[in-house]
Structures are given as structure tokens and as C-alpha cells.
């Protein structure tokens, strides 16, 4: 397993609809054709997997149907969008990139992006 540099922004603000996007850039040492991207959430020293996708270079990222993540790729850069976030989901979101094929296998883990989520104000009761 060889190490690879992964860059991501330190901070991002989620929209009032609970959508946050951030870029994950990796310094590919070779010509990878198959790449796996995993988003991890670190909170209170616990790390959990948020979502993961494997894609072929030049193709779209395909997450599972029930995933809260979507993404697009362009060269060595992946634009990740996480939806359905609430205030309790505020935390450090780490981008993990694996170059699966061809060998050698490379692994890179970013420093993490702090996503700040604020729950929207509840709509006032309406007479209509």
C-alpha cells in the first residue's frame, strides 16, 4: 500500500436545506482507471462511514440508491455533495481515496472538512 496526498477544504457551511458540498483532490502518482472514494465522519473520536463510491476514470460516481451522497469527478478532483444534514450532523468529514486499478494500490486520506449545519427555523403556523 502506497501513500497519496489528498486535499480538501478545512471548512464548509451547509445550506439551510441541509446540503453541503466540498471538493476532494488527490495527487495521482500514476494513471488509475478505477478509483474508490469514501466519506468518513469523525465525531467525538469515533469514525463512521457516511458513503462510498467506486468509479472508472471519466465516468460518473455511482453511490448506492439510498446514499445521502452524490458526486462528480473531473480529472483528479471529486466534487462531493452530502444531503439531508441536520445540526446534529455537524462534524469533520474526511475524504478517503483509493486507487484500485491498475496496481500498485494507493491510499490517501484528507485532513477532513468541518461541515457546519444549522437547522432551519421552523415555519410559523399559517392560517391557510
Amino acid at each position: 500500500c502506497k501513500a497519496m496526498h489528498v486535499a480538501q477544504p478545512a471548512v464548509v457551511l451547509a445550506s439551510s436545506r441541509g446540503i453541503a458540498s466540498f471538493v476532494c483532490e488527490y495527487a495521482s502518482p500514476g494513471k488509475a482507471t478505477e478509483v474508490r472514494v469514501t466519506v468518513l465522519r469523525q465525531a467525538d473520536s469515533q469514525v463512521t462511514e457516511v458513503c462510498a463510491a467506486t468509479y472508472m476514470m471519466g465516468n460518473e460516481l455511482t453511490f448506492l440508491d439510498d446514499s445521502i451522497c452524490t458526486g462528480t469527478s473531473s480529472g483528479n478532483q471529486v466534487n462531493l455533495t452530502i444531503q439531508g444534514l441536520r445540526a446534529m450532523d455537524t462534524g469533520l468529514y474526511i475524504c478517503k481515496v483509493e486507487l484500485m486499478y491498475p496496481p500498485p494500490y494507493y491510499l490517501g486520506i484528507g485532513n477532513g472538512t468541518q461541515i457546519y449545519v444549522i437547522d432551519p427555523e421552523p415555519c410559523p403556523d399559517s392560517d391557510f
Epitope: 471548512v11 466540498f22 485532513n111 468541518q114 444549522i118
Partner: antibody, heavy 115, light 109 residues
Amino acid sequence: QVQLVESGAEVKKPGASVKVSCKASGYSFTGYTMNWVRQAPGQCLEWIGLINPYNNITNYAQKFQGRVTFTVDTSISTAYMELSRLRSDDTGVYFCARLDYRSYWGQGTLVTVSA
Amino acid sequence: QAVVTQEPSLTVSPGGTVTLTCGSSTGAVTTSNFPNWVQQKPGQAPRSLIGGTNNKASWTPARFSGSLLGGKAALTISGAQPEDEAEYYCALWYSNHWVFGCGTKLTVL
């Protein structure tokens, strides 16, 4: 390499507005928040607020709330800061800055507010 | 609103070592505050030295290093040079905003 280039110096009258631009290059503009920072003559650096160019989400320091507006034009990778109802104590240098794991600053725009 | 505290001034001899600190009124500074250190010389724009605790900019000399020390962010200069004489600002991130300290005036004498 990453560069942030700001617009030129401005002289304004009290009560007027000023709009400063910051052109970014050398990185994915929509991928990183852009901050605006003020430095009054002989004073400390003061955070004005930030904008997320990807979704236009802004957060302004309470002190500037209601007087400042941030916008971006992603097609030309440029961020803008507009400050209205200018007062003499708004005189200072205004910086755009990408504050991050790797941080970058613009060269600054001097705004002078004088009657 | 959090307050970020720095030493108003420090003096170091050429070739000596000095540590500048950056504290937070809300408690211990952590990596989640993404401490940023900025150098500013008179009449010049600020220049980032270190971001996210210990990530050096490409132009940052090796003698500068960032760390967390006793609940504070710290900038250490090992082997100070006359050109290091400047104002040093620290910025900390608090969930959705940055707060700057009022700077440390470093004199190399």
C-alpha cells in the same frame, strides 16, 4: 499557483457604498470558502465574514450585519464585498483571504472614507 | 463571541528560539479550530505561514513550526533571523466563523 488579486484603492464619502473585488486563480474557486478581513490604520485584523462560492451561503460578523453583502461570479472566479452606509471609521485595508489548511491572502484594497 | 489572546510583544535574539501562543476564551484550542498563523510586515499584506495547526505554506521557512501546546496553538521559530521581525496574527475557527487575535509584535534584537 494560488493567487488572489484585489481591485484598486477607493475614496468614498460618508453614507456611500463601496464594492471591492477579489479575483482567484490557481485552484478550484467553488471548492473553498472566501473570507473578507479588514484592517483599520494601526489596528488588528478583523474578520468581516465569509461566503461559500459553491452555494452562495454567507456568514457575516455581527458588527457588519446589515451593511455588508458578499457575492461571487463563479464564471470568472471572482468574489465581491459591498459595504454600504460608509462611515469614517470604515477607512482601512480590506483583504480577501482563503483561510484553510493552506491559506492565501489578497494584496488588499485601501478604502478611504472622507468628507 | 470568543476572544483569541496573543502575547502583545516578544523579543528574541538572532539565532534564538521563541514561541508565540494563541489562546481561546472558550477553552483549549484543538485541531478543530484550524489554527492559522499569519505574518505581517509594516506596509505589507498579511502572509500565511501555517494553516490547520501545522501545515506550512510552500514559502514558509523550515525554522517556523506550528503545534498545540498546553491548550493553546503555538508558533515556534527556531533560529530567528532579522527578517522575522514582524507582527504575527493567529486566527481560530469557531463552528461557522473566524476570530483573529490582536497580534504579537516580534522584535529580533
